[in-house]
Every structure is written in C-alpha cells, then in structure tokens.
C-alpha cells in the first residue's frame, strides 16, 4: 500500500547554480490532485525548499518567487532549482502527496544529493 | 517556538453541536497539513480528520463522517472543527496536531474535553 | 485501514531495565511512515521516533526504533524514572491514519 518514490542518488549542479533531477512515483491509486515537495536535510534539520500543487495533467506551477520550476508528465515530475551556492550543498528529498480522490497517500524519495561548486570569479585579463 | 491550543470544549447534549479551536503559533501555518485526533477517557488515540494546506482537501474517519467538518482559516492562523449531531461516544479530548515535513505529528496542542451526556 | 496491535498491554519494570514493545502491522508499513509517542498522565503525546528508526528533536538516545514490513519495536535501553508512561505506534503512510492501542510501561 505504500507509495514508492524515486529520484537520482547524486546529480551536480551546473555553473550557474542550477540543478536539475527527476521524481518519479508509483501511484497506489488514481489521483487527480499531487503535491509535490522539495526538502532539504542538513543535520538531520528538514526545511522546505519549495512546493506545488498539480492537477494531472495540468502543469506543474510553483509560486513565483520560488526557486523551483517543475513539469509534470504521468507519475513523473522534472524537478529544477536554480540559484544555488556552494553553501547550499545537501540531500534533496522529494516528498509527493495524492491529495485527492481519498485515500490520501504520501511517499518521500531517499533524497539527492546535489553538489554545487562555486565559480571561480575570472582573472583580470589584459586586451 | 511551535504552539498549538486548543479552545472550544465543554458538555453538551446529545444531537446538538460544538466547534472547536486551534490557535496555531510559532511557524507559517499555511505550509503544514493538520490533523485533529481524539482520546476517550481511559483510552488510545483515535484520528478524526486531516485537512490539506490550503484547505481544500479534508479527510474524515468512519467514525465521524457526515457529522465533523474541519476547516482552517490561514489568515488567522487557526485550526477549526465543526462537531454536529454530537452522540455520547464522541466524549473525548480533542487534540489538534502539526504534520512534520516527513509525515509524524511532531507538535501537539494541550487538548480540550467534551462531554457529551444528557 | 491498516490496524496496530501493540504488545504487550502493560509491562512492569524497574527502573534501569530495558524496555522492549512491539507494534505489529495488519499488513505492509513502509519503514518510512511509521512513528512512536510517549505519553503521560494528563499530557498531549509526545513524538519519539519517527521513520521507524529516527529519534525526533530532543529526544535521549536510550530511546531506539527498528523494524521494517510488519513488525515494528520501540526499545528504551535503560528506563528512567520519567519514561513510565503509555506508547502508542502509528502509521502516516496513508489515511486512515491509524494508531496502535497502546503499551503501558509501568513501575514493578
């Protein structure tokens, strides 16, 4: 009865900031409403990063200032956070919620473990 | 720091109806489902209801289905439970409860009594 | 609606034994959604453990969980005066949310 959840053990965030994964859940049963959440882990403390609402097959909307941006097809969601810092290095657990039709399910994924490196700033040049 | 109190309990007959309080403080209330679970005197713990963020999605036990209605209001920070139709088993505390980021209820209210008996 | 049974109902201690409770599954939790509360006379439940295995904020390590599928165990290494209370297991995984009726830990 459980609902499994997966996602990516590692993935590296690019120059920019910006790290990108999929989560991908099994449904137990036929929802129309999923919430999906980003958590982060730091020793053993959990905070929300970002979360959203979707009707199936409707896209995938976070508020505008988050910092996540997501599309959503069947049981998957492609999950994208951006500005992120060398500071923000951490697991990243994706939570999903069949909010509706009952019964309620929830399914939390073994989390992501994104890398981010800062840019070196660019050496002073002579033209 | 998190706090949950409860309000709104008391003895009232049977058939007739009660609502019940939840004053939410010390996180932003909007971002966490709640829970309302009750304890009979002398007894375990019964969930009644769950209610998703922004309201819109509720869940009931068998128990009290048709009679409860919960609802939140998150501009006011606070947890409500309309009790109708209220019968003698109902007699309990009411307890309201945060849902943590993984899914427990790791905050709970103090719990308010009601006593329902002619 | 998945049910709880907990054993044993009421278990007599000293202080400084060890405290073994069980919660049994009517059928398959996933170990990420099942939790413990202590609770006292008078007093709203507390959460202990959560995720089966993860003790909650502020709790001792002589509190531990285990288990995984169908059976599930609370253990309290060394009972201290303060841990004589009832415990209740849940599941969160799915409504209805259920709870296990209790394991009473009491003074021998």
């Known amino acids: 009865k459980a609902m499994h959840v997966a996602q990516p053990a590692v993935v590296l965030a690019n120059s920019r900031g910006t790290a990108s994964f999929v989560c991908e859940y099994a449904s137990p049963g036929k929802a129309t409403e999923v919430r999906v959440t980003v958590l982060r882990q730091a020793d053993s403390q959990v905070t929300e990063v970002c979360a959203a609402t979707y009707m199936m097959g409707n896209e995938l909307t976070f508020l505008d200032d988050s910092i996540c941006t997501g599309t959503s097809s069947g049981n998957q969601v492609n999950l994208t956070i951006q500005g992120l810092r060398a500071m923000d290095t951490g697991l990243y657990i994706c939570k999903v919620e069949l909010m509706y039709p009952p019964p309620y399910y929830m399914g939390i994924g073994n989390g992501t473990q994104i890398y981010v490196i800062d840019p070196e700033p660019c050496p002073d040049s002579d033209f | 720091q998190v706090q949950l109190v409860e309000s709104g309990g008391g003895v009232v007959q049977p058939g007739r109806s009660l609502r019940l309080s939840c004053a939410a403080s010390g996180f932003t209330f909007s971002s966490y489902t709640m829970h309302w679970v009750r304890q009979a005197p002398g007894k375990g713990l019964e969930w009644v209801t769950f209610i998703s963020y922004d309201g819109s999605n509720k869940h009931y036990a068998d128990s009290v289905k048709g009679r409860f209605t919960v609802s939140r209001d998150n501009s006011k920070n606070t947890l409500y439970l309309q009790m109708n139709s209220l019968r003698a088993e109902d007699t309990a505390i009411y307890y309201c409860a945060r849902t943590g980021w993984l899914g427990p209820f790791d905050y709970w209210g103090q719990g308010t009594l009601v006593t329902v008996s002619s | 609606e998945i049910v709880l049974t907990q054993s044993p109902g009421t278990l007599s201690l000293s202080p400084g034994e060890r405290a073994t409770l069980s919660c049994r599954a009517s059928?398959?939790?996933?170990?990420?959604?099942l939790a413990w509360y202590q609770q006292k006379p008078g007093q709203a439940p507390r959460l202990l453990i959560y995720?089966?295995?993860s003790r909650a904020t502020g709790i001792p390590d002589r509190f531990s969980g285990s288990g995984s599928g169908t059976d599930f165990t609370l253990t309290i290494s060394r009972l201290e005066p303060e841990d004589f209370a009832v415990y209740y297991c849940?599941?969160?995984?799915?409504?209805?949310?259920?709870f296990g009726q209790g394991t009473k830990v009491e003074i021998k």
């Open positions: 995720g089966a295995s």
């Open positions: 849940q599941q969160y995984g799915s409504s209805p949310w259920t």
């Open positions: 059928q398959s939790v996933s170990s990420s959604f």
